[in-house]
Each structure stands twice: as structure tokens, then as C-alpha cells.
Amino acid sequence: TIPPHVQKSVNNDMIVTDNNGAVKFPQLCKFCDVRFSTCDNQKSCMSNCSITSICEKPQEVCVAVWRKNDENITLETVCHDPKLPYHDFILEDAASPKCIMKEKKKPGETFFMCSCSSDECNDNIIFSEEYNTSNPDLLLVIFQ
């Protein structure tokens, strides 16, 4: 629980508690914003981001965004609050321990995004279909 000597300020989103009233600690995420990337046509890639940040707010999760257009490929790594859209998309997989890339519709580019909730989980971004729970065979395995 929140120790009595820690003041719980009004409207304080820096103190987030779990179901037991214990103070939730923040996520540790790769945080290099947007960088050029050589990640292309691979099942998974490392971010090559050397900066691991303590997310500012405990409710934030790790996010990675992979974008490819006619000119270049970029990879973005950040912390973000899953209650808020990112690049106009909801972070639907924020509770996942792995960053499983899902394609999003964006005109003029190929756009993949993932989010996850384990230490530095956006360092390893996974494109492979074998991890995608929209795969019916995998769903069979999960629910057996």
C-alpha cells in the first residue's frame, strides 16, 4: 500500500496503485524517438536503441513504431499511456510481454506498431506470423 509518509496529492497521475493499493512502479523502455532503421523483411529486429528510460508515469507502456515509405525506414521507440491513442491508434496489446508488430492502415507508407509491458520489451520487435494471435492455428494451441 501507499506508505503513510508518501503524500498522495490530488489528481496525481504520478502515483498509480494496483488492485491491492500498492504503488505501481514505472516501466523501463527503449526510448530513442524516431531513428533510421535497416530492419526490413525480417521476422524480428532489435531496436539498436542504446537509451533505456524510466517512463515518466507508471501507467505508461513501451511502444515501437516501424514505418517504411519510398525514401526510408524508421523505427520509433517511446513510452506512452495506453489510455491515449498513439499516431491515432489505440494500443490494444499494451499488456503483452512481447512487442508483436501489427500493421495499421496509413496512406503512402507501410506502418506497423506494437506495445508491451515488460522491461525493455520494445527492444525486440517481432513481425513473425507465428506470434500473431490472429493466426487460427495458434489460437487452437492457446485454448487447448
Partner: nanobody, 120 residues
Framework: EVQLLESGGGLVQPGGSLRLSCAAS???????RMWWVRQAPGKGLEWVS?????????YYADSVKGRFTISRDNSKNTLYLQMNSLRAEDTAVYYC?????????????WGQGTLVTVSS
């Protein structure tokens, strides 16, 4: 019973240095990730720095990068925070907190805090 006891706080002039200590007893200190967390008067918690159990991997908030250094001595069950180039905005109560990294998503143990005041 787990106890975390911070010390080393005090009044220091801007640009000065302080070294905080946090002594742990009755805990699984050597297996746990340790944190320094601060709370300025009337403000929320700020997660200042963290260190992995092995002591080799450290993390810092942007506001203290390059000025603060976290370390630990597992043989003494003690956590440290070396604070250099202190600024007025570093004034806060500093807490150490212990996180069981084997699946816990919340702070397991907290110290009582030590007050750092940066003022001329």
C-alpha cells in the same frame, strides 16, 4: 520484517553535492531491483533512478542524467545515490524502494525518506 533506512539528506547550496544511503535489513536485497524516488513539496512522486540486482545496469530520469549516480553494495545491503550539481528543483524527500523483480508490479518496501533541501 523488512526495513529500509535512508540517510544523508540535508541543506546544500546550488551546485553542491550530497550522497544518500539506504540501508536494508530483513530483505532479499541482493535479488531485488532498487529505486530512488523523490517527492517535492506538494508534488507527485518522481522516479529518479533504478539499479538492477547485479549493480551493473542503471537507469535515470532525464531530469537527473549526468548529475546523479546510483550504486549499491550488496555485501552491505546498502543502496547509494551520489547527487552532484544540485539545483533548487532537486529539493524533495528522497525515498528508497525495493522491487521484487520476479513478477511484482508494485513497490514492495519503502523507506521513511530523507529530506534534501537545495537553497542558497
Amino acid at each position: 520484517e523488512v526495513q529500509l533506512l535512508e540517510s544523508g539528506g540535508g541543506l546544500v547550496q546550488p551546485g553542491g553535492s550530497l550522497r544518500l544511503s539506504c540501508a536494508a535489513s530483513g530483505s532479499t536485497f541482493t535479488d531485488d531491483r532498487m529505486w530512488w524516488v523523490r517527492q517535492a513539496p506538494g508534488k507527485g512522486l518522481e522516479w529518479v533512478s533504478a539499479i538492477q540486482p547485479d549493480g551493473h545496469t542503471t537507469y535515470y530520469a532525464d531530469s537527473v542524467k549526468g548529475r546523479f549516480t546510483i550504486s549499491r553494495d550488496n555485501s552491505k545491503n546498502t543502496l547509494y545515490l551520489q547527487m552532484n550539481s544540485l539545483r533548487a528543483e532537486d529539493t524533495a524527500v528522497y525515498y528508497c524502494a525495493e522491487q521484487d523483480v520476479k513478477g511484482s508490479s508494485s513497490f514492495d518496501y519503502w523507506g521513511q525518506g530523507t529530506l534534501v533541501t537545495v537553497s542558497s
